[in-house]
C-alpha cells in the first residue's frame, strides 16, 4: 500500500514567494520624466514587470509625509505629494490585487532624519503608528514595515501590539520588523514575543563569503528559530551589491531562493544594480536601470548588460536566473513548504536538500570559495527520510556551460568557483 | 558637459510656422525630456510643455494645443518645437530645457537646470 | 493653475545690501518643487535654488531660499554687482508647471 500523503501546511501569501522593496520609489521609476508622473503612478505602469519577477508582495516606501527629525510635521495617515496622492494609491492597490500582488507599507516614522524613531518621543511615535496601522489596513494595505527597531525603545511590547492591531484585523496581513543588527542573540529577543513577525536583519551579511561560515549561519538560526517562519535577505533595507561582489551574487540568489523561508530582495537586485558603479548615485538609492538611457549623465556609464531591458533578452543573465529561481519557488513544494538539511560536503562548499513527502526533492550546492573544489557529499548526515540518491538532474548552475536536464554523479560532483548548483531528483520509496 | 544648442533666430510672417531645434550633447539624449519655454519681450516665462525623447510622447499646455508639435530625431539628438499660424504676439524668445536629478534630505529633485541659450523668434508683416 | 505672484516688481538697491524677494502662490505648493532663476538680459535663466531651499550647483552661499506652503522668500545676504538682474519664482510640482512674472533687482 502507498503511504499516506503528509499533511500541507496552512500557508499564507508571504511563504508563496519573494518579498520585493522599493524603498525609493522615486529611484525605481527612473529620472528622466522628473516629477511628471507620480511615482506611484509609475510604479502601476511597472506592474507587468514585477508579475514578470513572480514575487508575491511589493514592499512600498515609506511614501508619508516627514519633516526630518519633527514629530509634528510627520503624518503617517499622509503620503507625501513627491510620490503621489491617497488617489494614486488606491488605483495602485487595485492594480496590484488584479495581478496577485501584496502591498505591504513601510510606516518607519522619521525615515529622513537622524533616528528613525525620534528618540525622545517614543510614545506619542508609538501612537501614530497605531493610529496608521488602523488606517491603512482600512484603506486595503496587505501589510507593513518597520525600519530600524533596534532604535526603538521597548521594541518587542510595541511590535506585540502592532502585531494583535495587524492580525486582529485578517490573519492574513503581514507585520515585517528590520533591524540593522547581525547579532542572533538580539535578533531572537526581538522574535521569541512575536512569534508570526517577519525579521529582516544583517544577520547574513558578514558571512564573510565562505562556504563553511555560510552554513553555520544558516543552520545555527534555523535551529535558533525552531520551526517558525523566517525570512532571508542581506539586510533591512540596502542592495546586495552593497554587500557581496559580483560574482557572489548569482550564488546568494540561488540560496536565498531555496532556503526554508521568505527570500526578500530590493529593487535591483534583480540586475545586480549597483550604486557604485554611477557614478554620483547615491549609495542607499540609486536610480533603477530600466534601460541604457535610465542613467543618462555619464554616455557610456551604462551597458546594455546592466540594465533590465538587456538583460531580459538574455537568457543567461541574472535577471533571467532570478527568473528561473523564483517561478521554481514559487511552484515547487519541496521549495515552498519542504524540511530543511545541510550537510558536509567539503571545505568552502555549503549543501543541503529540501524535500516535502513524496514530492520532487532538491539538492543545492554551493561553492563560496574562488577555486573550482570536488564537492564530498556526506549523506550520512542525512536522516533516511532525505537520503541521496547516486544521481540528480541539474536544474540549472549559476554559471554558463553545463548541460540543463543532464543527469549528474553525486559522487563526482565538481564546481566551478562561485558556482551554485540546482539539482532535482524524484522521491523514492 | 550638458550642452543644448539651439537653431539661430527667425522672422516669419503672420500666419507661418517655426520650427526651432535643439540639438543636445554631454549626455544620453533619450535620458532626459526636453521642455519648451517661451518668453515674450521684457515679459516672464511661459512653459509650453515637453517631449520624451526615448517615446516620442507629448505634453502640450493647453494654451498652445493644436497650434505646437514637439518632435525628436535621437540618431542626431535633436528636439524641435513647431509653432504653426504664428500671431504677432507669438513674438518672444524660445527656449529648450532640461532638468537636472538632484538628491537632497532623502528625496529626488528635478529642476531645469540646463538650458538653450534661446532663439528669437519675430513675427512681423 | 497654480498662480504665482511675485513682490516687489522692481528692488532698487545698493551692492552690499540684503535683497529679500517674495513669491506667493495660489494655492499650497510641495516645497520640494519650488525653484527660483536669475535671467540677466540677453542670457537664458540660470537655476539658482530648486526644492525652496536647497542651493544649486555652482550657486554662491549668499543666495537662500526658506518658505513652504503658499509663502516663499528669496534672499541675497549681500548683494554682489552681478546680482543686478531679474528673478524668477518657479513651481514644477503640478502640471502646468508656471513662473512668476519677476522681480527686477537694479542699481540704486
Known amino acids: 500500500r502507498a503511504p499516506r500523503c503528509r499533511e500541507l501546511p496552512a500557508q499564507k501569501w508571504w511563504h508563496t514567494g519573494a518579498l520585493y522593496r522599493i524603498g525609493d520609489l522615486q529611484a525605481f521609476q527612473g529620472h528622466g520624466a522628473g516629477n511628471l508622473a507620480a511615482p506611484i503612478s509609475g510604479l502601476k505602469g511597472r506592474l507587468d514587470y514585477l508579475s514578470s519577477l513572480k514575487v508575491k508582495g511589493l514592499v512600498l516606501g515609506p511614501i508619508h509625509k516627514n519633516q526630518k527629525d519633527d514629530v509634528a510635521q510627520t503624518d503617517l495617515l499622509q503620503i507625501d505629494p513627491n510620490f503621489g496622492s491617497k488617489e494614486d494609491f488606491d488605483s495602485l492597490l487595485q492594480s496590484a490585487k488584479k495581478k496577485s500582488i501584496r502591498v505591504i507599507l513601510d510606516l518607519t516614522p522619521n525615515y529622513r532624519g537622524e533616528n528613525s524613531w525620534f528618540s525622545t518621543q517614543v510614545d506619542t511615535v508609538a501612537t501614530k503608528v497605531k493610529d496608521a496601522l488602523e488606517f491603512w489596513l482600512q484603506a486595503g494595505v496587505d501589510g507593513f514595515q518597520v525600519r530600524d527597531i533596534e532604535n526603538l525603545k521597548d521594541a518587542s511590547s510595541f511590535l506585540a501590539e502592532w502585531q494583535n492591531i495587524t492580525k486582529g484585523f485578517s490573519e492574513d496581513r503581514l507585520l515585517i520588523a528590520g533591524t540593522n543588527s547581525s547579532d542572533l542573540q538580539q535578533i531572537l529577543s526581538l522574535l521569541e514575543s512575536n512569534k508570526d513577525l517577519l525579521l529582516t536583519s544583517s544577520y547574513l551579511s558578514d558571512s564573510g563569503s565562505t562556504g563553511e561560515h555560510t552554513k553555520s549561519l544558516v543552520t545555527q538560526y534555523l535551529n535558533a528559530t525552531g520551526n517558525r517562519w523566517c525570512s532571508w535577505s542581506l539586510s533591512q533595507a540596502r542592495l546586495l551589491t552593497s554587500f557581496l561582489p559580483a560574482q557572489l551574487l548569482r550564488l546568494y540568489q540561488l540560496m536565498l531562493f531555496t532556503l526554508p523561508g521568505t527570500p526578500v530582495f530590493s529593487y535591483g537586485d534583480e540586475i545586480g544594480l549597483d550604486a557604485a558603479a554611477l557614478p554620483g548615485q547615491p549609495m542607499e538609492a540609486p536610480v533603477m536601470l530600466w534601460d541604457e538611457s535610465s542613467f543618462p549623465d555619464i554616455p557610456g556609464a551604462v551597458s546594455a548588460n546592466m540594465t533590465v531591458k538587456g538583460q531580459s533578452e538574455d537568457p543567461g543573465s541574472l535577471l533571467s536566473l532570478f527568473r528561473r529561481l523564483s517561478d521554481q519557488r514559487s511552484k515547487e513544494r519541496s521549495l515552498l513548504h519542504g524540511d530543511f538539511h545541510a550537510f558536509s560536503a567539503g571545505p568552502g562548499l555549503f549543501s543541503y536538500i529540501r524535500h516535502w513527502d513524496q514530492n520532487e526533492r532538491f539538492l543545492v550546492v554551493l561553492n563560496f570559495g574562488d577555486v573550482g573544489l570536488s564537492a564530498g557529499l556526506q549523506a550520512s548526515d542525512l536522516p533516511a527520510s532525505a537520503s541521496l540518491p547516486a544521481k540528480a538532474d541539474l536544474l540549472l548552475s549559476t554559471q554558463p556551460g553545463r548541460e540543463e536536464g543532464s543527469p549528474l554523479e553525486l559522487e563526482r560532483l565538481k564546481l566551478e568557483p562561485h558556482e551554485g548548483l540546482l539539482l532535482r531528483f524524484p522521491y523514492a520509496a | 558637459q550638458v550642452q543644448l544648442v539651439q537653431s539661430g533666430a527667425e522672422v516669419k510672417r503672420p500666419g507661418a510656422s517655426v520650427k526651432v531645434s535643439c540639438k543636445a550633447s554631454?549626455?544620453?539624449?533619450?535620458?532626459?525630456?526636453i521642455h519648451w519655454l517661451r518668453q515674450a519681450p521684457g515679459q516672464g516665462l511661459e512653459w509650453m510643455g515637453w517631449i520624451n525623447p526615448n517615446s516620442g510622447d507629448t505634453n502640450y499646455i493647453q494654451k498652445f494645443q493644436g497650434r505646437v508639435t514637439m518632435t525628436r530625431d535621437t540618431s542626431i539628438s535633436t528636439a524641435y518645437m513647431d509653432l504653426s499660424r504664428l500671431r504677432s504676439d507669438d513674438t518672444a524668445v524660445f527656449y529648450c530645457?532640461?532638468?537636472?536629478?538632484?538628491?537632497?534630505?532623502?528625496?529626488?529633485?528635478?529642476?531645469?537646470?540646463?538650458w538653450g541659450q534661446g532663439t528669437l523668434v519675430t513675427v512681423s508683416s | 493653475e497654480i498662480v504665482l505672484t511675485q513682490s516687489p516688481g522692481t528692488l532698487s538697491l545698493s551692492p552690499g545690501e540684503r535683497a529679500t524677494l517674495s513669491c506667493r502662490a495660489s494655492?499650497?505648493?510641495?516645497?520640494?518643487?519650488l525653484a527660483w532663476y536669475q535671467q540677466k538680459p540677453g542670457q537664458a535663466p540660470r537655476l539658482l535654488i530648486y526644492?525652496?531651499?536647497s542651493r544649486a550647483t555652482g550657486i554662491p552661499d549668499r543666495f537662500s531660499g526658506s518658505g513652504s506652503g503658499t509663502d516663499f522668500t528669496l534672499t541675497i545676504s549681500r548683494l554682489e554687482p552681478e546680482d543686478f538682474a531679474v528673478y524668477y519664482c518657479?513651481?514644477?510640482?503640478?502640471?502646468?508647471?508656471?513662473f512668476g512674472q519677476g522681480t527686477k533687482v537694479e542699481i540704486k
Open positions: 526644492g525652496a531651499s
Open positions: 518657479q513651481q514644477y510640482g503640478s502640471s502646468p508647471w508656471t
Open positions: 554631454g549626455y544620453i539624449f533619450t535620458g532626459y525630456y
Open positions: 494655492q499650497s505648493v510641495s516645497s520640494s518643487y
Open positions: 530645457a532640461r532638468i537636472q536629478v538632484y538628491y537632497d534630505g532623502g528625496i529626488y529633485n528635478y529642476p531645469l537646470h540646463h
